[in-house]
Structures are given as structure tokens and as C-alpha cells.
Amino acid sequence: KTLVLGKEGESAELPCESSQKKITVFTWKFSDQRKILGQHGKGVLIRGGSPSQFDRFDSKKGAWEKGSFPLIINKLKMEDSQTYICELENRKEEVELWVFKVTANSDTHLLQGQSLTLTLESPPGSSPSVQCRSPRGKNIQGGKTLSVSQLELQDSGTWTCTVLQNQKKVEFKIDIVVLAFQKASSIVYKKEGEQVEFSFPLAFTVEKLTGSGELWWQAERASSSKSWITFDLKNKEVSVKRVTQDPKLQMGKKLPLHLTLPQALPQYAGSGNLTLALEAKTGKLHQEVNLVVMRATQLQKNLTCEVWGPTSPKLMLSLKLENKEAKVSKREKAVWVLNPEAGMWQCLLSDSGQVLLESNIKVLPTWSTPVQP
């Protein structure tokens, strides 16, 4: 008995070959002897029932001249899994068709961190093995149900599942979209008083995007976090529901999600967590955002530079007179110079690769007051 594997919804070709390699009479039947189709000597395909009943069954007329009389079954259904009989040249060929189906749990659009379950449906009597490969090369294998926990952004794309039965295989491709922000975290460095732009680009595109979101903010100086803004998303259009009075954030009306803080102030420095709940999805998308604020001031005979917010312990804060060596450099959040000489002073926040933030302050001769450009 020949075995053919098929995929639900696709086509299968069941072979039937003549030894004479020329056109001959043949008939395809179900195992209960009901006729499906055949050719009775006139080179015409004759179906065994009403067109509506047998419109999924066909043969390859072009192959008949070569002595090949396949049965083509289109739009395969699970119930097509059975034995088919090809009668030709006073012999009967039995062909077993097994139709398989691999589906993803409920939805192919899943949130980052959620689980993906892939389920194999197979005909009674079959004992297939299945292995699925993620777009990033992760292999999972097992029985009829395969699970991947903690989906990551790199898991977005085409998953390939190979079903193996009696040394024959059939391959399924399932497109999975992992819903996430492009970046898990970002840091914005600003001088006091500058406008701050926060952007939250998504790592996926869908036709319609509906949901609601909120930005919670933990200021470095505050004892608890507070909600800065809540918003709705309807068909990719953003509308603000509620915003705090201090600070009064502005939000862009289109994607990507975009927030503007009118000015960076020390009391706003800290970390935020933007959450986005999507319609018909359990769980939320998250993106962390951090704000570091720098202030340079001169009070009487003391020139001070300070930073607020979540900085790496490797960052260096320096005060230097323009075009001169740094007067003071510390891996701390505040530096100062007593009795600074007149000129343009620079406060610099640096790491190993660049100056992240710079603020200039002009120190006038002692009889004048300072000017901040």
C-alpha cells in the first residue's frame, strides 16, 4: 500500500502508474467501491457523482499519455484521510492518504513574553513525529502539542513545522507575529529647560490597531510613581484620555507613539514605563524610558554642575573652562568649583565613547552676575 501525506486546505496527488507507459482505462474508487473518477477509453475524464460532490477531485490529463493516472484531491479535508483504490490493467492499487493539520493556539499575533502552542491534528492510526523551527533557529519537538514559553521579538516570522510519518514528511509554514516595542529601554539626556521627545516605535505592523495605554513615571526625587498620561488607540489614531497638570505632556495623534515634555526639569528626571494594552489581547506591551537632566548654576563663589536621573556608575561628570583641562571630574552626580575664573565653563557628562550631555555657563568677572546662554 502506498502512503501519501497531505496538508489540510492544500492538494495531494495520489499515484497510479501503468506498466505500459501509455493511455489506458482506469478508475479511482473509495474503499467502499464508490467511484470517484476515471477514463473509459475515449480520453475523457468521467466523474463518479454530481459536480458539487466531486469538484475537488481531478486527474492530470497531460500525464495519461505517459501511463500516469494520478488522483488529485484539492482543498484537502481531515476526513479525506482514507484508502483510495486505483483500478487499471486488471489490477488494484491501494493508496493511503493521511491529511495533517498544524495550527497555532487561538491567535498568530502574540505578545512578547507570552507562550506559543502549536498543535498537530492527525488521522486515527497515524503516529507522526513533529519538529518545529522558529525564525531564529530554535528547534522544538514532541508529540501532538508543542509549546514555546516567553516569546521574544526574534520569534516573529515564519515557523516551519515538519511532520514525519513512515519516512515521509510534510512541511507546514505558520506566520507568527510577536507584538512588542522595537526597544525594551531607552535613555534621553537633556539640559534643564530643553524640550524632551519620547518615542515608542512598535516592532510590528497590523491593519487595525486598537487599545489603550498609560505612562507611569517614577521620578528620582519622588517616593512613589504616578501616572503621567493615559490614552486610547483606535485604528492607529491616538487620543489622550487624561494627563497630569504637572508635567503637562503632549502626545502625537498618529503612530509611532510620541510624547513631548515641554521642558526637562530636575524633578522630572527618572524612569517611566509605558504600557500598551491591545484589544482582544491578554497582557500588555512595555517599554522603559529614562530621563537624565543636567543643570549648571553659579551661586556666589560656587559653580555647580548636577545631573539627576538613572545614570550608569561609569559616567563622568566634569567642569572645565573652555579649551582647558577639566578642573574637576568625578564619577558622581554633582561637581563644583569654588571661585571659578571668568570665562565660558562647560559641564560635561561623558562615558567611554562620547559626551552624552553638555551645558555651558558663562562666569563673569566677580563684580558681574552670571549669564546662562
Partner: antibody, heavy 122, light 107 residues
Amino acid sequence: QVQLVESGGGVVQPGRSLRLSCAASGFTVSSYGMHWVRQAPGKGLEWVAIIWFDGSNKYYADSLTGLFTISRDSSKNTLFLQMNSLSLEDTAVYYCAREVALEGYYYYMDVWGKGTTVTVSS
Amino acid sequence: AIQMTQSPSSLSASVGDRVTITCRASQDIRNGLGWYQQKPGKAPKLLIYTTSSLQTGVPSRFSGSGSGTDFTLTISSLQPEDFATYYCLQDYNYPYTFGQGTKLEIK
């Protein structure tokens, strides 16, 4: 093509000094933090030192402070490691590496040289 | 200085296996951790930076996770070219420190 090539290794007696060089091509050392990392025969990697993009800051492994000095010459696009009072434990392959720093948050050594071998032996 | 403890020190596995290497910091390093691969006679190669960011050109079977003091490198399906020594590096603060390494061998 971004590349780092170390030189200056060799056999040296204990207590003596040696200066290693690392020539950079395809980028400028004055735009990146630059590291030295070493590996004793059959042992793991040991971080040695870093010099910042502007040369303003230098940091060393605790055990090497005062013995080794990291420096660079921007005009020659070259990194150096001056090693004084060498001991048998300083026998190793010395690698230089470039550090990428993004947003004051993401740091990584993405380009490494092939290494130069220093053997301290009496 | 921050101490990094890597485990196991050696590991035998087969092609196709899923492998996990862990690294523990002696204090909180947030997510200041990278993973490097080294083959005999060669310079180290960056795989993962800032705990979970995959370096460009590195196969996606490599992934990193963790935060604070406990970190993990996972190779989802071992390939013949993955047999090497792996090091974690804390770059949260100076002086930087490497883990002692994990030698991944063919079973």
C-alpha cells in the same frame, strides 16, 4: 575595513618593562573607548584596562594599577600599553579591543585584534 | 571589584541540544552584562550585549536573559561551530570583570 593589529610582544625577563602597541584602521581611536584584555596560557580572559575616547579617563584591573599604563596617540591612531616590573604571571596573549558605547546604556567590545604574546621568563 | 561566577566550567553536549550557561555577579549590575565566544588560538567574539541584545551577524539561536545578579546565555539548538569557550563580562562598572569561562565540548 575595521581592524586592530597588536605588536610589541616578545620574551622579557622578570622586573623588566615592555610596551605593546595596537594599530587601528578603518576607524579613529579618538572616537571610541579602547581596551586591553589578556589571557594567560590555558586560562580565561582577564580585563586589563580602558582609555576613554578623549583620553580623559583611564581605568585598570585592581591588581595592575600602578604597574601598567594605557595611552594612545591619536595622530598615529594607535593604542599603547606600557608594562613595568613584569612578573611571570604577566605571561599572556594581550588583545586590544574597541568598545562601542550607546546612550550611556549599551556597551560592548565589537572589534578585537588577533593578540600579541608576551612571555616573562628568566 | 565585582566578581563574576560562571557555571558550569565545562559542558558536554550534542548537535541539536539546547544549552544554558549561567553567570552570577557578586552585586547588582542591572543589565550590564555581555557574552563572548572564543575558539582556540582566536580572539574572543561578541555574541550578546546589555544582557539580551544580539550582536549583528550572530545567529538567532543565541539568546541572553537575566538582570541584577543572575544571567543566562542560551543556545537553542547547538551547531557544530558552536563548540568553543564562552565568557560573560560585566561592563556595569570599572574595573570590568570576566567570568572564568565555560568550555562547551562535543559529547
